[in-house]
């Protein structure tokens, strides 16, 4: 019984790990800006799942910087006072209020690029980020509900006769565990102080023609399947194989 997925149900595909830190962004290039200008302004808020330990770039509405008066990034993180990073074009000055996380910075000089970057995203970066652009034509907003994703560590083992245990440890949000074939299963969820969740599913198969069982773990960071051969010997421990 995994946690409900966010509304956009964005499934991040797993890929081969690069040595460089992966980076994600919802920013648009110049061509997209002109095509989607009005559409983006209407989409004020975006739910955005981001993998932990990657870099993230958050963008302001696609307004030409020459039309700008003030850019403000408002950052609301759990249990902290609201942090604001502001840039005033007329005086070319920046100001920060209640901002303590050094990993959250302007991408470059705000007079050249209004984007915000988070270097090495951590669980504590879960929160709401909003860019407010003040122009002669009015104020334009773009907000992000940033959901930090943590890939669970998946294990599968047999701990008793015809009983297997599949665990998705310390994931965020909670993973969902399913079995093929279905057995007599009990699932536990545990919530940890660092914001992660462990899901443990213990299943028993009474039917003796079931020799191999598969644990399928669904998670926003990607899915994983492990299978194991059920041993007849009580108490025998056997590790799983990855598909």
């Amino acid at each position: 019984e995994g946690a409900a997925q966010p509304n956009n149900s964005l499934m991040l595909q797993t890929s081969k790990e690069n040595h460089a830190l992966a980076s994600s962004s919802l920013c648009m290039d110049e061509k997209q800006i002109t095509q989607n200008y009005s559409k983006v302004l209407a989409e004020v808020n975006t739910s955005w799942p981001v993998k932990m330990a990657t870099n993230a770039v958050l963008c302001c509405p696609p307004i030409a910087l020459r039309n700008l008066i003030i850019i403000t990034w408002e950052i609301i993180l759990r249990g902290q006072p609201s942090c604001t990073k502001a840039y005033k074009k007329e005086t070319n000055e920046t100001k920060e209020t209640n901002c303590t996380d050094e990993r959250i910075t302007w991408v470059s000089r705000p007079d050249q690029n209004s984007d915000l970057q988070i270097r090495t995203v951590a669980i504590t970066h879960d929160g709401y980020y909003r860019c407010i652009m003040v122009t002669p034509d009015g104020n334009f907003h773009r907000g992000y509900h940033l959901q930090v994703l943590v890939t669970p560590e998946v294990t599968l083992f047999q701990n008793r006769n015809r009983t297997a245990v599949c665990k998705a440890v310390a994931g965020k949000p909670a993973a969902h565990i399913s079995w093929i074939p279905e057995g007599d299963c009990a699932t536990k969820q545990e919530y940890w102080s660092n914001g992660t969740v462990t899901v443990k599913s213990t299943c028993h198969w009474e039917v003796h023609n079931v020799s191999t069982v598969t644990c399928h773990v669904s998670h926003l960071t990607g899915n994983k399947s492990l299978y194991i051969e059920l041993l007849p010997v009580p108490g025998a421990k056997k590790s799983a194989k990855l598909y």
């Epitope: 759990r78 249990g79 951590a122 669980i123 504590t124 879960d126 560590e153 701990n159 008793r160 009983t163 245990v165 440890v169 310390a170 009990a186 536990k188 969820q189 545990e190 919530y191 940890w192 102080s193 660092n194 914001g195 992660t196 462990t198 443990k200 213990t202």
Partner: antibody
Framework: QVQLQQPGAELVKPGAPVKLSCKAS????????MNWVKQRPGRGLEWIGR????????HYNQKFKDKATLTVDKSSSTAYIQLSSLTSEDSAVYYC????????????WGQGTLVTVSA | ENVLTQSPAIMSASPGEKVTMTCSAS?????MLWYQQKSSTSPKLWIY???KLASGVPGRFSGSGSGNSYSLTISSMEAEDVGTYYC???????????FGGGTKLEIK
Amino acid sequence: QVQLQQPGAELVKPGAPVKLSCKASGYTFTSYWMNWVKQRPGRGLEWIGRIDPSDSETHYNQKFKDKATLTVDKSSSTAYIQLSSLTSEDSAVYYCARSGGWLPGFAYWGQGTLVTVSA
Amino acid sequence: ENVLTQSPAIMSASPGEKVTMTCSASSSLSYMLWYQQKSSTSPKLWIYDTSKLASGVPGRFSGSGSGNSYSLTISSMEAEDVGTYYCFQGSGNPLMYTFGGGTKLEIK
């Protein structure tokens, strides 16, 4: 309502083992982990380890790995902790406490068993 | 292992006085729990999810904090608040539950 019942006290000779019990009632015993916590007189709380009654999976604080063994009896909804080769350092109150679910901690505690190691 | 350091170890307050105790974590957390323990009794869950009061806890108590730094505050000290308060976390792989060393609160 949830209850965790523990005997009040145990007097043990140095070098001997002791097995303490914690009888659970008011909930499905196999649905929650059972933890054990040690408190020496006038001192703080230390987590010893925990056991999943559904399949007897255990996690131990490394400090207590050679001292404590956790077991359960599902038929009587009782959790046990066996402490080996007792010394004066083991004189303490031992609490059982239920964890699991939405709370990353222990919502329910037993009254504790005072273990006194004395010749 | 995430080490929790509480300060002060012992404090005393007069009735009506505001009381604040802190808990520092060696690794960043999303949630902190607090327990209250009175002499010769089991600990009681007092605050969970950093700032939510457990059932039966008076409204003069509050919790706050984020990341590595958390605090428990009593807006107006009362005699029944005497006891030892422990911060608590559960996380890690392998799992480890840890308690802070405790803050003993006495009344003047």
